[in-house]
């Protein structure tokens, strides 16, 4: 089923850091300014609507569960922050059961925000069915929520 | 090398559209971001707005309601369109690339002056 | 907005001596120990040309004359020693919070 992890272990996660560069002039990934993580939470926006959309017109009358929390913000900052780490393995998990396409597109926006070296957690798909479902319009609703709240934050003036 | 080159009208009417066009060759439009940006004849700068690699775009609050960025991928050219132009709006007006997270605009056009007068 | 203001407006320096230019910002511009604050240099007629981003790094091909200092909120770019194709106009410009905003510019004359 699905193995959750505490948000004493996600605050671990943030304590570790490390100063790797993506490219000569670019930042740390840890390290990027609310403008840029704006940026990239423009490009995921439409990206998690549309997956969204066409799960729930292919999925009809599936329910959210109750049993999923996607922990998708941290704890430790002002304004949140997206908790990259805490996201990716539920997207890597749904990523053969739903569009890999644009799932792909997801997980290269949200490994630009990750902190260097996370470990992250493995996430298993519930082998029923329509428990399965159920999961995976649970991320995909809580992670276009997510977006929406982290995007009025950073929306919201000084940060 | 990247280079960028700015085209359009040097003059415009009060209340029309001022419409331009950026050319960009050595790099693609569809990686990065692709920035207009202009310069008051007071020497003042301002940051107007990008169309990013998959066509997001975003613009300065203040020209919110009137800008509009668009791009052709197949031309490599993306465009700005002021709509309501007034004569605050005469500028120098700049493209520029944002090509990494956390770094600055490092290629600039060389700038195309537009005056707004009847 | 962040608001930049930079200091003085304007500047004369005889070549060979140091050059110096504030840009300060109207709140912190700084992330996990990276100041999101850039310099550019705007000769007569033409764009403005990145000499520094992060506030202290030199942009490839840049003469290492300029150099860029400061964090938070109060920033220095330094030219030493300045040579008479220095002249121009110099802004500051953050990348921390949308939107993007620039300095009012430094004009470097040369004794």
């Known amino acids: 089923m699905l193995s959750h992890t505490g948000p004493s272990r996600f605050a671990l996660f943030l304590l570790c850091s490390m100063e790797t560069l993506l490219s000569s002039h670019m930042a740390p990934t840890h390290q990027l300014p609310p403008s840029d993580v704006r940026k990239i939470i423009l490009e995921l926006q439409p990206l998690s609507r549309g997956l969204l959309e066409d799960y729930q017109k292919k999925e009809t009358g599936v329910p959210e569960s109750n049993r999923t929390l996607l922990l998708c913000l941290t704890s430790d900052s002002q304004p949140p922050r997206l908790n990259s780490s805490a996201i990716l393995p539920y997207f890597r998990a749904i990523r053969p059961l739903s569009d890999k396409n644009i799932i792909d597109k997801i997980i290269e926006q949200l490994d630009k925000l990750k902190f260097q070296h996370e470990p992250e957690t493995e996430i298993s798909v519930p082998a029923d069915t329509f428990e399965c479902k159920s999961f995976i319009l649970t991320i995909l609703q809580q992670f276009s929520a997510c977006l929406e709240s982290v995007f009025k934050s950073l929306n919201s003036g000084p940060q | 090398e990247v280079q960028l080159q700015e085209s359009g009208p040097s003059l415009v009417k009060p209340s029309q559209t001022l419409s331009l066009t950026c050319s960009v060759t050595g790099d693609s439009i569809t990686s990065g971001y692709w920035n207009w940006i202009r310069k008051f004849p007071g020497n003042k700068l301002e940051y107007m707005g990008y169309?990013?690699?998959?066509?997001?775009?975003d613009y300065n609050p203040s020209l919110k309601s009137r800008i509009s960025i668009t791009r052709d991928t197949s031309k490599n050219q993306y465009y700005l369109q002021l709509n309501s132009v007034t004569t605050e709006d005469t500028a120098t007006y700049y493209c520029a690339r944002y090509g990494n997270y956390g770094y600055a605009m490092d290629y600039w056009g060389q700038g195309t002056s537009v005056t707004v007068s009847s | 907005d962040i608001v930049l203001t930079q200091s003085p407006a304007s500047l004369a320096v005889s070549p060979g001596q140091r050059a110096t230019i504030s840009c300060r910002a109207s709140?912190?511009?700084?992330?996990?120990?990276?100041?999101?604050i850039h310099w550019y240099q705007q000769k007569p007629g033409q764009s403005p040309k990145l000499l520094i981003y992060r506030a202290s790094n030199l942009e490839s091909g840049i003469p290492a004359r300029f150099s860029g200092s400061g964090s938070r909120t109060d920033f220095t770019l330094t030219i030493n020693p300045v040579e008479t194709d220095d002249v121009a106009t110099y802004y500051c410009?953050?990348?921390?919070?949308?939107?993007?905003?620039f300095g009012g510019g430094t004009k470097l004359e040369i004794k």
């Open positions: 709140e912190s511009v700084d992330t996990y120990g990276n100041s999101f």
């Open positions: 169309i990013s690699y998959s066509g997001i775009t």
């Open positions: 410009q953050q990348s921390y919070e949308d939107p993007w905003t």
